[in-house]
């Protein structure tokens, strides 16, 4: 229960706080969970414990694993676990989902993006900010303390924002980057852009040859009159009606509207008698309104038929 997931990139600093809290006067011991070996407190070590903090300066992929922290007071011991994963640096610009911190939302009135985990580090301003790997330039962007302020937010400001800063430890500098998604909400509080909730991007759906399969494309649209709001499936970039395969049909599924004016639509793709050639197709779930288009791609893979018991 008292377990926390932490992640970082190789050759960057990573600092992890013990999920169990205690007074500053309490001692905290850190161990490698697998070996029960104590983690040193001497700062000359690359990985060392410093009270409630576990420091990787810098982190290596081999550091990945579960670490145990024990908060010791005169009357009790509290145990916590830090599940640490260190990833190799990505060669391309794409930040994978597992490296993302929680999504934040902004509107015209409030558009602060806080740099995740920065409070754990000894850093000095200014922070550097990037959007989709491009350094942010222009007077609309202001790096202020540990957050970024965007003036006159537009739907185009949605995207993945990375903050980069330097952690200083005893005169040595270590780079740290952290990325989170930013979505733009209308004043009623939901993204103006369509939001696809299912399927996940690049999802692999297991199907059995000869059986029927259903794929659901489900998306929500922001508050207000939606002059154009549609959810649909495409096969290899072609509309279902134009694809000309009678075994594959789409039909409208559940539609529901919610108290904040949010409207959500489902479109179910039904594939009858799945064939080998269906596995070669690209299935695109599209959601569009006047603010833009979102696309999530699904591929089918063969599921080994379950062994029947007689």
């Amino acid at each position: 229960k008292f377990s926390k997931q932490s992640w970082g990139l190789e050759n960057e600093a990573l600092i992890v706080r013990c999920p169990r809290q205690g007074k500053p006067s309490y001692t905290v011991d850190w161990y490698y969970s697998q070996t029960n070996k104590s983690i040193p407190t001497q700062e000359r070590n690359r990985v060392f414990a410093s009270g409630q903090l576990l420091k990787f300066l810098p982190a290596a992929v081999a550091d990945s694993g579960i670490y145990t922290c024990i908060v010791r007071s005169p009357t009790f011991n509290r145990t916590g676990y830090a599940n640490v994963t260190i990833y190799k640096k990505q060669s391309d610009c794409n930040v994978p989902d597992y490296l993302m911190y929680s999504t934040v939302s902004g509107s015209e009135k409030n558009s602060k993006i806080y740099c995740p985990t920065i409070d754990l580090y000894n850093w000095t301003a200014p922070l550097e900010w990037f959007k989709n790997c491009q350094a942010l330039q222009g007077s609309r962007y202001r790096a202020h303390k540990s957050f970024l302020v965007i003036d006159n937010v537009m739907t185009e400001d949605a995207g993945d924002y990375t903050c980069k800063f330097i952690h200083n430890e005893n005169g040595a500098n270590y780079s740290v980057t952290a990325t989170r998604s930013f979505t733009v909400k209308d004043e009623q509080g939901f993204s103006l852009f369509p939001v696809i909730g299912a399927p996940a991007q690049n999802e692999i759906k297991e199907v059995e040859i000869g059986k029927n399969a259903n794929l659901t494309c489900s998306a929500c649209f922001g508050k207000g009159t939606q002059f154009l709001a549609a959810v649909l499936w495409q096969l290899n970039g072609t509309k279902i009606t134009d694809f000309g395969e009678p075994r594959i049909q789409q039909e409208e599924g559940q539609n529901q509207s919610f108290s904040n004016g949010l409207a959500c639509l489902d479109m179910v793709l039904r594939i009858a008698d799945v064939k080998e050639e269906d596995l070669l197709l690209q299935y695109d779930c599209l959601a569009l309104n006047l603010h833009g288009l979102r696309r999530h791609t699904v591929r089918l893979s063969r599921k080994n038929p379950s062994k029947e018991c007689f």
């Epitope: 377990s3 997931q5 929680s102 999504t103 939302s105 909730g197 529901q256």
Partner: nanobody
Framework: ESGGGSVQAGGSLRLSCAAS????????MGWFRQTPGKGREGVAS???????IYGNFVKGRFTISEDNAKNTLYLQMNSLKPEDTAMYYC?????????????????WGQGTQVTVSS
């Protein structure tokens, strides 16, 4: 899930859903209900940022909340009506994009029956 049962119209119930085994920083949890012969209907959802969304029929009568320390999701139901009679399910997904749409959710509870009599 727990907390279901029988209640008179106008009464209250509090449903609980205890989750175990997840430590995700980005998540969405929801409550759904289903009556015989009908599809699951979204009641309410809450995500890791604390954003809540309710089905139009709720009209301020229900409140979704969570206790992170206990990994528990709640649905406080007040001013219950006979038409609220249904099997109630809690569900979760590992993404903070959130709305109470059944097709969005991966993990489902077993359900708890709520019966409201007039």
């Amino acid at each position: 899930e727990s907390g279901g049962g029988s209640v008179q119209a106008g009464g209250s119930l509090r449903l609980s859903c205890a989750a175990s085994g997840y430590t995700y920083s980005r998540y969405c949890m929801g409550w759904f209900r289903q009556t015989p012969g009908k599809g699951r209907e979204g009641v309410a959802s809450i995500n890791s940022d604390g954003t809540t969304i309710y089905g139009n029929f709720v009209k301020g009568r229900f409140t979704i909340s969570e206790d992170n320390a206990k990994n528990t999701l709640y649905l406080q139901m007040n001013s219950l009506k006979p038409e609220d009679t249904a099997m109630y399910y809690c569900a979760a997904r590992v993404d903070s994009t959130c709305a109470p749409m059944p097709s969005w959710f991966t993990y489902w509870g077993q359900g708890t029956q709520v019966t409201v009599s007039s």
